[in-house]
């Protein structure tokens, strides 16, 4: 077990609407120190959403993911640790404002902290269940997240914490599906990805294809929120307190205040760097803008946090 810092590193101000469990690959609980309890759900597209642990669909989803993880472990799942080099990149993001994606270390964790791996390498994430994540959150994982038709139709009514590169640590995040790829569902701005490699576990049943390419924000997206389309508001408020505020996309109840606070733990320096992770900003229907990722490539991992700069926040008001 890893006992990381007990400081709250993910806080949720808004809960997502329902998400099909078929789209989820992992969940974890936020820390007790966060006050309001929440389940952090990770989708096939490596987006994180806050969910209310009291809701039945969340309980069912966790149970489902637990079963999947257990089945995978029974079938000889193995752990594979990957260290990722995180490079600053600029990519188009949907929205019409500059968002500074900044990683700020909040605490020192153990040697196995969250680390980025290529998003197409979902298969290579650690398998099994571990009681505690490095940051002191518990988690389990399971399946994959699918595509959606048209951007104007919306996305899940949800509070996306941020889009996180696939991560794995020996004995922490797990995924029971061989691959959880997919178009950028919600936060459509992302860095280009390196070519995927086939998951050996799929062998003959695996699919082969050329390297991934950029996804267009305007496609592949509909709605999770039972019959409603998101009504994005072009207002994003920066919260000055606490850890780095991460953008959250509320897909129906979208508006100010949908912010999640994320702290980042330094990544262990062992291993060799792999491809860059994906970073993404908020999903909005129009316009494009760059996301600037600024970080120490060797030391910081996973929790990429889109944050609007002060000017951007002003422009959006």
């Amino acid at each position: 077990q890893h006992h990381g810092v007990t400081k709250c590193n993910i806080t949720c101000s808004k809960m997502t609407s329902k998400i099909p469990v078929a789209l989820l690959i992992h969940y974890q609980q936020n820390q007790a120190s966060c006050g309001k309890r929440a389940i952090i759900l990770e989708t096939r597209q490596h987006r994180l959403f806050c969910a209310d642990p009291k809701e039945q669909w969340v309980k069912d989803a966790m149970q489902h993911l637990d079963r999947q993880a257990a089945a995978l472990t029974r079938n000889g799942g193995t752990f594979e640790k990957q260290i990722g080099e995180v490079k600053p990149r600029t990519t188009p993001a949907a929205g019409g404002m500059d968002e500074s994606v900044v990683l700020e270390p909040e605490a020192t964790g153990e040697s196995s902290s969250l680390e980025p791996t290529p998003s197409s390498q979902e298969a290579q994430r650690a398998l099994g269940t571990s009681p505690e994540l490095p940051t002191g959150v518990t988690g389990s994982s399971g399946t994959r997240l699918p595509p959606t038709p048209k951007a104007q139709d919306g996305g899940p009514v949800g509070t996306e914490l941020f889009r996180v590169p696939p991560v794995s640590t020996a004995a922490t995040w797990q995924s029971s599906a061989p691959h959880q790829p997919g178009p950028s569902l919600w936060a459509e701005a992302k860095t280009s990805e390196a070519p995927s490699t086939q998951d050996p576990s799929t062998q003959a049943s695996t699919a082969s294809s050329p390297a991934p390419e950029e996804n267009a924000p305007s496609e592949g997206q509909r709605v999770w929120g039972q019959g409603q389309s998101p009504r994005p508001e072009n207002s994003l408020e920066r919260e000055e307190m606490g850890p780095v505020p991460a953008h959250t996309d509320a897909f129906q109840d979208w508006g100010p205040g949908s912010m999640a606070h994320v702290s980042v733990v330094p990544v262990s320096s062992e291993g060799t760097p792999s491809r860059e992770p994906v970073a993404s900003g908020s999903w909005t229907p129009k316009a494009e803008e760059p996301i600037h990722a600024t970080m120490d490539p060797q030391r910081l991992g996973v929790l990429i946090t889109p944050v609007p700069d002060a000017q951007a926040a002003t422009r959006r008001q």
Epitope: P20, P147, P149, P183, S184, E193, T202, A216, R222
Partner: antibody, heavy 119, light 107 residues
Amino acid sequence: QVQLVQSGAEVKKPGASVKVSCKASGYTFTNYYIHWVRQAPGQGLEWIGWIYPGDGSPKFNERFKGRTTLTADKSTSTAYMELSSLRSEDTAVYFCARGPTDGDYFDYWGQGTTVTVSS
Amino acid sequence: DIQMTQSPSSLSASVGDRVTITCRASGNIHNFLAWYQQKPGKAPKFLVYNEKTLADGVPSRFSGSGSGTQYTLTISSLQPEDFATYFCQQFWSTPYTFGGGTKVEIK
């Protein structure tokens, strides 16, 4: 407009393999999943699996794992489903269908490919 | 796996009738249900997703409702072109499963 055009009917012997193609047009191929669904004569629909053309990763219905291969060629916007070790009960119409990223429902379908397995 | 049971398996109705088709899931699918219409020799056509949201171009006489394990597709006033077989599909969890179909025939 969005179109999925499948290859023509096939007649195969038991134990053989069949490869069905599905050419997509009218949208960005790499932004959606391609699902494969089959329908035996007079029967209901059965989901086989999906492939995400963006990176070629697949997911299968356990019933089809091991003898199904799903591939996608981004250069031609074509997805393929290969089913091996055919048996008579594989006789069916095989459909490809487009799936969005927010849920695996199928908003556009190919016209279907009839595969007959007979000795 | 979640089993989807449709009822009735067939029904006879006249133009203008109100028709209701039911789909029952073996577990809670949390409204992640789609409906399709299929005519003989054709591919299914997407009608409804997320239990009640109509797909583009689907006439408003079609409506979906339900929650938990029970869902219905209603055609408020049956039109000649609506005579077909209707399938439900759950997309809450894999493997995605379909109902056995309901054939709507002309009385």
